[in-house]
Amino acid sequence: RKIPKVGHTFFQKPESCPPVPEGSMKLDTGIINENQRVSMSRNIESRSTSPWNYTVTWDPNRYPSEVVQAQCKHLGCINAQGKEDISMNSVPIQQETLVLRRKHQGCSVSFQLEKVLVTVGCTCVTPVVHHVQ
Amino acid sequence: GIAIPRNSGCPNSEDKNFPRTVMVNLNIHNRNTSTNPKRSSDYYNRSTSPWNLHRNEDPERYPSVIWEAKCRHLGCVKADGNVDYHMNSVPIQQEILVLRREPRHCPNSFRLEKILVSVGCTCVTPIVHHVA
């Protein structure tokens, strides 16, 4: 999947653009908004009617090296009595993010962008019921 | 499990792991072969904490289109379709990495940017604060 060129006609390539080899792009890894923090409600993973656990994946050849993945604890949802209600479903909510991978090509090191699908949390949904004729 | 050492008082220094500027292959490797993100496309309507999806478009960013979730209700939807205000619909947020064109309008020069997106909503029991 190639990164699309800028589409609008008024986005002509400015003279100030750095020279880049064919088939490559220049990437500055100094992150904009580096210290931004998630401000989610407290402990929503345990307070949710579709609670989830977190697993940390760690990869020394990836930036960011740490990616946190959620897994729904139950197939059903937790009702007001604290019991699992299997007439409802806990389902994962997912979001794509980019990561940067450091790879080896022969004797040289190269960099590749990868799309990774992160499971962010879970939500409780009414199941889709298929009626058999 | 895996434990990542972390000093909460320090800024994230993980970027020590990568050079400040790198040349990257234009092709983006997509490893999501086993999971179909479209599978969750109707969850926003079927959830007990439903949400609306708002299109955020920015031609200076890759991906240029990001969908932002906004919870429809303060409470959660009951089986009878009514909203239960004893429960709360809350957004699930995620930090993601995107590419920002830098300098602006340049086709093949980018900088990594961390952005916060609301991906969907979940129904939670509220935190009750008892006043003495």
Partner: antibody
Framework: EVQLVESGGGLVQPGRSLRLSCAAS????????MHWVRQAPGKGLEWVSG????????GYADSVKGRFTISRDNAKNSLYLQMNSLRAEDTALYYC??????????WGQGTTVTVSS | EIVLTQSPGTLSLSPGERATLSCRAS???????LAWYQQKPGQAPRLLIY???SRATGIPDRFSGSGSGTDFTLTISRLEPEDFAVYYC???????FGQGTKVEIK
């Protein structure tokens, strides 16, 4: 020839410390992430810790978090594992392994650590 | 915590037969990779397969890996005498190993 040679194992009492070393040769050491994996007698493999090519990122198994520290000296082509507050359950053969991005492609022969009073 | 379950625990086969080893993950993650290792008594593990299906350098083509999501398979098309060993699967990224499958001579 790509080679990894571990050393520093031995018999140690519970609560004491030990430092393992791994000497690498035959490849550009500072280009690769490195790991420690252990195997208790008659048991399976357990990943212990890993470190990126330039020490910028480190990971630890929950079982050793806060007790073990992984480090490397690229100038000496060496990987280390500082093991503190050792327990009987840390008794194992400790392997040093090279990371090839998707797996561990080169392993040493291991060094034995025995924790016993 | 991610668990990799290998089956069967022991596989008793004769040289020339086909061996099929299974590895099931309790959770599938995008950006995690599955590898297979072979270990003989008194020896270090040896990488056979990485990224689910890619053969490591010097590994004979009788070894093949397949699978996706949570179910993975290592197949040895025709067992040679030197293939009798313990085989481990591993999820790179979560750093979990399976408990191993012993392939023994029948």
């Amino acid at each position: 020839e790509v080679q990894l040679v571990e050393s520093g194992g031995g018999l140690v009492q519970p609560g004491r410390s030990l430092r393992l070393s791994c000497a690498a040769s035959g490849f550009t050491f500072d280009d690769y992430a490195m790991h420690w994996v252990r195997q208790a007698p008659g048991k399976g493999l357990e990943w212990v810790s890993g470190i990126s090519w330039n020490s910028g990122s480190r990971g630890y198994a929950d079982s050793v978090k806060g007790r073990f520290t992984i480090s490397r000296d690229n100038a000496k082509n060496s990987l280390y594992l500082q093991m503190n507050s050792l327990r009987a359950e840390d008794t194992a053969l400790y392997y040093c392994a090279k990371d090839m991005v998707y797996a561990l492609d080169v392993w040493g022969q291991g060094t034995t650590v025995t924790v016993s009073s | 915590e991610i668990v990799l379950t290998q089956s069967p625990g022991t596989l008793s086969l004769s040289p020339g037969e086909r061996a099929t080893l299974s590895c099931r993950a309790s959770q599938s993650f995008s950006g995690s990779y599955l590898a297979w290792y072979q270990q003989k008594p008194g020896q270090a593990p040896r990488l056979l397969i990485y990224d689910t299906s890619s053969r490591a350098t010097g590994i004979p083509d009788r070894f093949s890996g397949s699978g996706s999501g949570t179910d993975f398979t290592l197949t040895i098309s025709r067992l040679e005498p030197e293939d009798f060993a313990v085989y481990y699967c591993q999820q790179y990224g979560t750093w979990t190993f399976g408990q191993g499958t012993k392939v023994e001579i029948k």
